[in-house]
């Protein structure tokens, strides 16, 4: 059943004398493996013998391979899938039909393949895109229906016979579908490539020429133009004539329209290849070009810069920047239309020529107030001198100058006075709009630049003012020199450093923090009595009687100030102790007797000790000793001792007499 044999291979293979042919081939014999293979050249079926006749190029049997002449033909296949063949070298007389006679156990098949061998290497074929436009990348393809592993070839691209520098990509195909060698070249043609010959050259491995194909490039492009001008330098004076001519050096396809442009704008009614300009004016200066269009698009010539020369026009001055701040830099620019450009400038400040200033720009690195005013200039070129324009105004701004703070009051100023100050200045640009005062205070400003300080403080030492426009200028501080009575008067103990004990040497100092004027007098007083007129009050040996409230006074020509009352405390051991008895020193037995220890002490007595007539201490530590019920045996002399942090003091003896009650007497 012949339907069981399936073959795939190229229908026809191409080669040339001395080259080789590689035949990619696959098959499928579904009933079993291949047992016999014969390669025929132009096979013909013989009905008598039921066999094929023809030249046997290759034969393979179960017994083994039959060698072919010089091993020219090789079967590179296998028994079930591959039927690839190679003929190397191939000859002209190999052209025709190759027959592959396949036999398996039960089936036979004859597969035919066409072989076309030419005498000389056949040319490749160049493929071009349908249209080529300048600067648009295209791919040129060179195709050769040949490829063989045993015969390497190369394809080279030439432009007008010179190898092209662009890199080509060569690919080969040796598959059951196709056999070819292809070279692809990416290329961006320019208009100058139009009409040029491109060649694809087939070469062997050594670069020897085998064959080629050529094509002529048809590169579509916009018209390429040349512009010519009379006079050739395109420099004229007002009133002269100018002629410009437009020439087309190349156009594909043919051009259709012509126009002229000045500074990119189309000139009306100028549609010929010649542009005539009669009696030109300076306004006709500019860049001219011609534009010619075809189906691809418009082409433009290079620009011709027509210069119509004229004397400078009236100048204007540009100032960078006005208003200018004093100390900043300023640049003046003289602007005057002229052709050629001005070569010399004359500058004026307030109508007076500025010596040595001949440049287009004037630079003043450090502006001062006197630089203010009107600046103008005159420009000059080879055709004449321009007129002086209206000029520009430079405004120089600066902080207020020579600011001073002035005291309006008669001197001296006393604490509590109302002080008026004014803030004066010499000049200012812009005008002074406000004033500032240092230090800040809740002060009145009755009018601009005037400060009124009600009830001036003793510590208002200096005042400074600032006059302000966009900036503030501060005056040097002015001293108010306020006079005041002595301040912060206080009594300070100089010695002793610790607490004062009776008998100590004591010194008190009358201190004050400040006084203006500085000349002062001192007064000491205790309970309204004057004690001394020195800054110190001294006690050689202090006694408890010196304790009390002390004040000192300090006065100057403005007034006098008293200290706070200062308490002088003298510490002393208990003294003047005595025992008092209640209800009296004679008490009836059975009643209550209270003994009190009276004393004078600073600090007060912390505890007492009570003693009887035998100096035996009683277990009491309080000021009062209560005997209840009192007995006759309690009669006797008692004394007490008082103790504080300074020391001890004792009382003299006090006698308590306890007498019998009437009941006791009655019982006896």
């Amino acid at each position: 059943d012949s339907s069981k044999w399936v073959f795939e291979h190229p229908e026809t293979l191409y080669a040339w004398e001395g080259a080789c042919v590689w035949i990619p081939c696959t098959y499928r014999a579904l009933d079993g493996d291949l047992e016999s293979f014969i390669l025929f050249h132009n096979p013909e079926y013989n009905k008598n013998t039921s066999k094929f006749d023809g030249t046997r190029l290759y034969e393979s049997t179960k017994d083994g391979k039959v060698p072919s002449e010089q091993k020219r033909v090789q079967f590179l296949g296998d028994k079930n899938k591959n039927c690839t063949l190679s003929i190397h070298p191939v000859h002209l007389n190999d052209s025709g039909q190759l027959g592959l006679r396949m036999e398996s156990k039960t089936e036979k098949w004859m597969e035919r393949i066409h072989l076309n061998v030419s005498e000389r290497p056949f040319p490749p074929h160049i493929q071009l895109p349908p249209e080529i436009q300048e600067s648009q990348e295209v791919t040129l393809t060179c195709l050769l229906n040949f490829s063989c592993y045993g015969y390497p070839i190369q394809l080279q691209w030439l432009l007008e016979g010179v190898p092209m520098r662009q890199a080509a990509v060569t690919s080969t195909s040796l598959t059951i579908k196709s056999v070819f060698t292809r070279s692809e070249l990416k290329f961006s043609p320019q208009w100058s490539h139009h009409g040029k010959i491109v060649t694809c050259q087939l070469q062997d491995a050594d670069g020897k020429f085998l064959s080629n194909d050529t094509v002529q490039l048809n590169v579509k492009h916009t018209p390429k133009l040349e512009i010519k001008v009379t006079p050739s330098d395109a420099i004229v004076r007002e009133g002269d004539s100018v002629t410009m001519t437009c020439e087309v050096s190349s156009s594909n396809p043919e051009y259709t329209t012509v126009s002229w442009l000045k500074d990119g704008t189309s000139l009306k009614k100028q549609n010929t290849f010649t542009l005539n300009l009669r009696e030109v004016t300076k306004d006709q200066s500019g860049k001219y070009c011609c534009q010619v269009s075809n189906d691809v698009g418009p082409g433009r010539s290079e620009e011709v810069f027509l210069q119509v020369q004229y004397a400078p026009e009236p100048s204007t001055v540009q100032i960078l920047h006005s208003p200018a701040v004093e100390g900043s830099q300023v640049e003046f620019l003289c602007m005057s239309l002229a052709n050629p450009l001005p070569t010399n400038y004359t500058w004026y400040h307030n109508g007076k020529e500025m010596q040595g200033r001949t440049e287009e720009k004037v630079h003043i690195p450090k502006i001062l107030p006197w630089h203010a005013g009107t600046y103008s200039c005159v420009a000059e070129n080879i055709l004449g001198t321009g007129q002086r324009g209206p000029g520009a105004e430079l405004d120089v701004q600066y902080p207020p100058k020579k600011v001073t703070t002035v005291i309006q009051n008669p001197m001296p100023i006393r604490e509590g006075d109302t002080v008026t100050l004014s803030c004066n200045y010499n000049s200012s640009n812009p005008s002074v709009t406000r004033y500032e005062w240092k230090p800040h205070g809740a002060w009145e400003e009755p009018s601009l630049g005037v400060l009124k300080i009600q009830n001036v403080g003793w510590d208002n030492t200096t005042i400074a003012c600032a006059a302000c426009n966009s900036w503030c200028s501060w005056a040097s501080p002015v001293a108010l020199n306020v006079q005041y009575a002595p301040r912060d008067v206080r009594v300070r103990k100089i010695k002793p450093l610790s607490e004062i004990h009776s008998g100590n040497s004591v010194s008190l100092q009358c201190d004050f923090s400040s006084s203006h004027p500085k000349e002062v007098q001192f007064f000491w007083e205790k309970n309204g009595r004057l004690l001394g007129k020195e800054s110190q009050l001294n006690f050689d040996s202090i006694s408890p009687e010196d304790a009390g409230s002390y004040s000192c006074w300090v006065n100057n020509s403005i007034g006098q100030t008293a200290s706070k009352a200062w308490t002088l405390e003298v510490l002393y051991a208990p003294r003047r102790l005595r025992v008092s008895m209640s209800p009296g020193d004679q008490v009836m037995e059975g009643k209550s007797a209270t003994l009190t220890c009276e004393s004078d002490a600073n600090p007060p007595v912390s505890h007492y000790t009570w003693f009887d007539w035998n100096n035996q201490s009683l277990p009491y530590h309080s000021q009062k000793l209560r005997l209840e019920p009192v007995k006759v045996q309690h009669s006797g002399a008692y004394w007490c001792q008082g103790t504080n942090s300074v020391g001890k003091g004792r009382s003299p003896l006090s006698t308590l007499t306890v007498y019998y009650s009437p009941e006791t007497i009655g019982r006896r």
Epitope: S606, N614, L618, H621, S622, H634, G636
Partner: antibody, heavy 119, light 107 residues
Amino acid sequence: QVQLQQSGPGLVEPSQTLSLTCAISGDSVSSDSVAWNWIRQSPSRGLEWLGRTYYRSTWYNDYAGSVKSRITINPDTSKNQFSLQLNSVTPEDTAVYYCARDRNGMDVWGQGTMVTVSG
Amino acid sequence: DIVMTQSPSSLSASVGDRVTITCRASQSISSYLNWYQQKPGKAPKLLIYDASNLETGVPSRFSGSGSGTDFTFTITSLQPEDFATYYCQQSYTTPLTFGGGTKVEIK
């Protein structure tokens, strides 16, 4: 070593007299550097000083104001002891009664006697 | 009479804690203040006399300070045997008076 030994009834009828004795060993009731105290303790009143006796050149007594009209503390030099007498007792006098020596603080105490006033 | 006010009336503490008790007199008593410890069913025991003097045989962890009207009693590191009630007492004048006591309990 100084010791104080208390003696006396634990139950006293209301309006009767409470009598307790404190016997001293290791010290003298007539010592002139100490005082001999009676203190009682009850849940309602806490520690309450009642009075003291002490000898200097003669005998002295001090009593708390709350019991001044009912109390007597006597020294007995012959027996080296001191006693407490509290007249006209009421149930409020129910407490633990202590005797104590005072020499820079009460440094020696009796064992305490629980006295209940109940009819 | 001089009134002695003790605070707090009770406190809970752990072994090793520092415990402080204060006592205030209604008038100045100089340094005539004593501190006592009392355990249930026992008589009070003198610890400190005259505000800061340690009674013979009393451990040094007990201390006292103050004079005038304000006094402090401190146990620096509480021991298991220290859980008891503590009293202050003035010996400045008669009647002798005691504070209300501070009960130190185990936390």
